[in-house]
């Protein structure tokens, strides 16, 4: 008998997957930028705001070159999971106060979730180690006041913007190694 019938190409090649992940990350970065502008317009920030529960920025863009594919994807996935959790918390805790941003915040959450699934799929396709997610973090305390929630929103969107900017650079660099 001749060789067995092959399978039609059913799903994207990991390099194509990486391309679409970069596109999704870029569009999420733009969503975050627009949302940050809206937030600053409606609730001007007085300087930078921090939130202790947010992840620290994974890496400066300059140090990206030394990174390996698994560590970039693993760290990126962990950080984005944390931001997803913070966005969910923000929408729950600040529903009424941030109503003007609500459709956009909902879209951001959906796209963040989609990006996380893309990253996981990419790691599976490449057979890279996928660390178990951290044990569930303690629930985030509700903001002490409306203004506290707005400060948290500034911190979350600002941190997410930096992380996504780092992610786009990192993913583009990784593409050259695939």
């Amino acid at each position: 008998p001749g060789p067995p019938p092959g399978s039609p190409r059913a799903s994207p090649d990991p390099r194509a997957e990486l391309d679409s992940t970069v596109l999704l990350t870029r569009s999420l970065l733009e969503d975050t930028r627009q949302l940050t502008i809206q937030l600053k317009d409606k609730f001007p920030a007085d300087g930078d705001h921090n939130l202790d529960s947010l992840p620290t920025l994974a890496m400066s863009a300059g140090a990206l070159g030394a990174l390996q594919l698994p560590s970039v994807l693993t760290r990126l996935r962990a950080d984005l999971l944390s931001y997803l959790r913070h966005v969910q918390w923000l929408r729950r805790a600040m529903g009424s106060s941030l109503k003007t941003l609500e459709p956009e915040l909902g879209t951001l959450q959906t796209r963040l979730d989609r990006l996380l699934r893309r990253l996981q799929l990419l790691m599976s396709r490449l057979a890279l180690p996928q660390l178990p997610p951290d044990p569930p973090a303690p629930p985030l305390a509700p903001p002490s006041s409306t203004w506290g929630g707005i400060r948290a929103a500034h911190a979350i969107l600002g941190g997410l913007h930096l992380t996504l900017d780092w992610a786009v650079r990192g993913l583009l660099l990784l593409k050259t190694r695939l």
Epitope: A10, S11, P14, R117, S124, L126, P132, P133
Partner: antibody, heavy 114, light 111 residues
Framework: EVQLLESGGGLVQPGGSLRLSCAAS????????MHWVRQAPGKGLEWVAV????????YYADSVKGRFTISRDNSKNTLYLQMNSLRAEDTAVYYC???????WGQGTLVTVSS | QSVLTQPPSASGTPGQRVTISCSGS?????????VHWYQQLPGTAPKLLIY???ERPSGVPDRFSGSKSGTSASLAISGLRSEDEADYYC???????????FGGGTKLTVL
């Protein structure tokens, strides 16, 4: 069209060795993690081993750890499974699979019997 | 004993809708790891049917759909056809193995 073609299966005595090969074509082999998955006669699928796209990560099911070795040659688009100290319970059809796994070969039968 | 639990068998008549469940734990499906589904027709190799919980590879009819909630997932087949008679397996990444784990498989019979 994606093709994965396993070879190297056959009858071997307990304690013996066998080396399976899987020739890949129709896709960018070096961009995919590769798996070996087996299926004992009349049973379900059991994952055996995986190797990352560049060969730097290898993981094994507990049932084969220390006896089986997975490897790949990206220049030849070929995946390998070196099986040593074979046991009767290793009797199965061995499939080579790419990605999630997204693509599967047709399998090669390994029979361990005296 | 499989890490992912599936019913050993399921059945339906042509045109019906059947659902196959896949139950995991907090260490695999419940930890956010995606679920994939495979179809194995008699005497053939498995074929990817659904990936990332609900995505259909090109060429898979939209009669097949997947979903995931909490620590379990399910595969639904609507408009059942005789050619759907096969074994169906779910799979998810297991971090303790650094590899996928498969369910025990569900034999679907079209009556």
């Amino acid at each position: 069209e994606v093709q994965l073609l396993e070879s190297g299966g056959g009858l071997v005595q307990p304690g013996g060795s066998l080396r399976l090969s899987c020739a890949a074509s129709g896709f960018t082999f070096s961009s995919y993690g590769m798996h070996w998955v087996r299926q004992a006669p009349g049973k379900g699928l059991e994952w055996v081993a995986v190797i990352s796209y560049d060969g730097s990560y290898k993981y094994y099911a507990d049932s084969v750890k220390g006896r089986f070795t997975i490897s790949r040659d990206n220049s030849k688009n070929t995946l390998y499974l070196q099986m040593n100290s074979l046991r009767a319970e290793d009797t199965a059809v061995y499939y080579c699979a790419a990605g999630v796994p997204d693509y599967w070969g047709q399998g090669t039968l390994v029979t361990v019997s005296s | 004993q499989s890490v992912l639990t599936q019913p050993p068998s399921a059945s339906g008549t042509p045109g019906q809708r059947v659902t196959i469940s896949c139950s995991g734990s907090s260490s695999n499906i419940g930890s956010g790891y995606d679920v994939h589904w495979y179809q194995q027709l008699p005497g053939t190799a498995p074929k990817l049917l659904i990936y990332s919980n609900e995505e259909r590879p090109s060429g898979v009819p939209d009669r097949f759909s997947g979903s995931k909630s909490g620590t379990s997932a399910s595969l639904a087949i609507s408009g059942l056809r005789s050619e759907d008679e096969a074994d169906y397996y779910c799979a998810a990444w297991d971090p303790s193995l650094s590899g996928p784990v498969f369910g025990g498989g569900t034999k679907l019979t079209v009556l």
